[in-house]
């Protein structure tokens, strides 16, 4: 799988999007999990509503929320009040029975300062010999959410390494 890098600023909110084929994954619940090491399972953080038809309802686990646009085919995860320890490798998953398909691998980076965001020209992308075959960067700065406010999607640059 390609890996997408999402960068956010400590104390602010970050929105992660995972697009998927809505027909292929019709009727399937989704999940957001964290890979805590090179080996071992992906640790579930939050999953969509138990009733697939209600997947559009936002579900929270602590400061992490998930919502699914099943018609448009976009799973959205919001990390509120981002902290350094939220950084890590995550997966968006499509669930079927006890199995899970990976929709997207996501690397979340938490920066100390908005000025630490690099310009597109400064970003580095891994080559084929690196840990991931390909990288796709969503370079985002989000603002803090007011209570009950729906976060706006991050401004992003899309980069592909071939």
């Amino acid at each position: 799988h390609n890996t997408t890098v999402f960068q956010g600023v400590a104390g602010q909110s970050l929105q992660v999007s995972c697009p998927y084929d809505s027909m292929k994954h019709w009727g399937r619940r989704k999940a957001w999990c964290r890979q805590l090491g090179e080996k071992g399972p992906c640790q579930r953080v939050v999953s969509t509503h138990n009733l697939w038809l209600l997947s559009f309802l936002r579900r929270w686990n602590g400061s992490t929320a998930i919502t699914d646009d099943t018609l448009g085919g976009t799973l959205t995860i919001t990390l509120r009040n981002l902290q350094p320890h939220d950084a890590g490798l995550y997966q968006c998953q499509s669930l079927h029975g006890s199995e899970a398909d990976t929709l997207r691998k996501v690397l979340v980076e938490v920066l100390a300062d908005p000025l630490d965001h690099r310009d597109a020209g400064d970003l580095w992308f891994p080559g084929e010999s690196e840990s991931f075959e390909d990288a796709h960067v969503e370079h985002s700065i989000s603002r803090s959410l007011l209570e009950g406010e729906i976060p706006f999607p991050p401004t992003s640059h899309h980069h592909h390494h071939h």
């Epitope: 902290q83 950084a87 630490d116």
Partner: antibody, heavy 121, light 107 residues
Framework: EVQLQESGPVLVKPGASVKMSCKAS????????MNWVKQSHGKSLEWIGV????????SYNQKFKGKATLTVDKSSSTAYMELNSLTSEDSAVYYC??????????????WGQGTLVTVSA | DIQMTQSPSSLSASLGERVSLTCRAS??????LSWLQQKPDGTIKRLIY???TLDSGVPKRFSGSRSGSDYSLTISSLESEDFADYYC?????????FGGGTKLEIK
């Protein structure tokens, strides 16, 4: 076995710059964050900043912004820290410390042996 | 910045004695705290992370605990190799900060 081998002690003149290295072995270099920490003589530790070797993204302690620059060379699994405009206040031992998997969510499990920097005319 | 107030700054104790060191966080750090040991040659080793999880290879006489904003490192029965400097580290938020250190000396 995880090892972080830091470069040797250096004596530099005030106003000069110094670039120290931390060569990592025993693990996949790009999978783990690398932190840098300062310890002035007889004092406690201060976190300087962190770099994600996979993307090159950095975060700095505001106190060291403009003083320290963190970089990596993935081909040699080496992290670097450059300190500029050196003064006697920069005389210290500097440590590299590996974080956890694409994060620092469990702190710094592995430490280098430290590089002594002495600033003197 | 989060201040980590470590006490005592120095401690004299005898072999076999039980000792406790404490770090108080000025803000909530939710257990994102580790304890480090620094030997006289400068070598630093992590003993405990996530407030109470013992690192592999660390003797069981070391333990970590939390009570509100107070975090403690306890050595149940001191051995000669335990005499060193100890630091707490919070990695909950930027900038990461260390306690002032405790010098543990032989009485």
């Amino acid at each position: 076995e995880v090892q972080l081998q830091e470069s040797g002690p250096v004596l530099v003149k005030p106003g000069a710059s110094v670039k120290m290295s931390c060569k990592a072995s025993g693990y996949t270099f790009t999978d783990y964050y690398m932190n840098w920490v300062k310890q002035s003589h007889g004092k406690s530790l201060e976190w300087i900043g962190v770099i994600n070797p996979y993307t090159g993204a950095t975060s700095y302690n505001q106190k060291f912004k403009g003083k320290a620059t963190l970089t990596v060379d993935k081909s040699s699994s080496t992290a670097y820290m450059e300190l500029n405009s050196l003064t006697s206040e920069d005389s210290a031992v500097y440590y590299c410390a590996r974080g956890t998997y694409y994060s620092n969510y469990e702190g710094f499990p592995y430490w280098g042996q430290g590089t002594l920097v002495t600033v003197s005319a | 910045d989060i201040q980590m107030t470590q006490s005592p700054s120095s401690l004299s104790a005898s072999l076999g004695e039980r000792v406790s060191l404490t770090c108080r966080a000025s803000q909530e750090i939710s257990g994102y705290l580790s304890w480090l040991q620094q030997k006289p040659d400068g070598t630093i080793k992590r003993l405990i992370y996530a407030a109470s999880t013992l690192d592999s290879g660390v003797p069981k006489r070391f333990s970590g605990s939390r009570s509100g904003s107070d975090y403690s490192l306890t050595i149940s029965s001191l051995e000669s190799e335990d005499f060193a400097d100890y630091y707490c580290l919070q990695y909950a938020s930027y900038p990461y900060t260390f306690g002032g250190g405790t010098k543990l000396e032989i009485k």
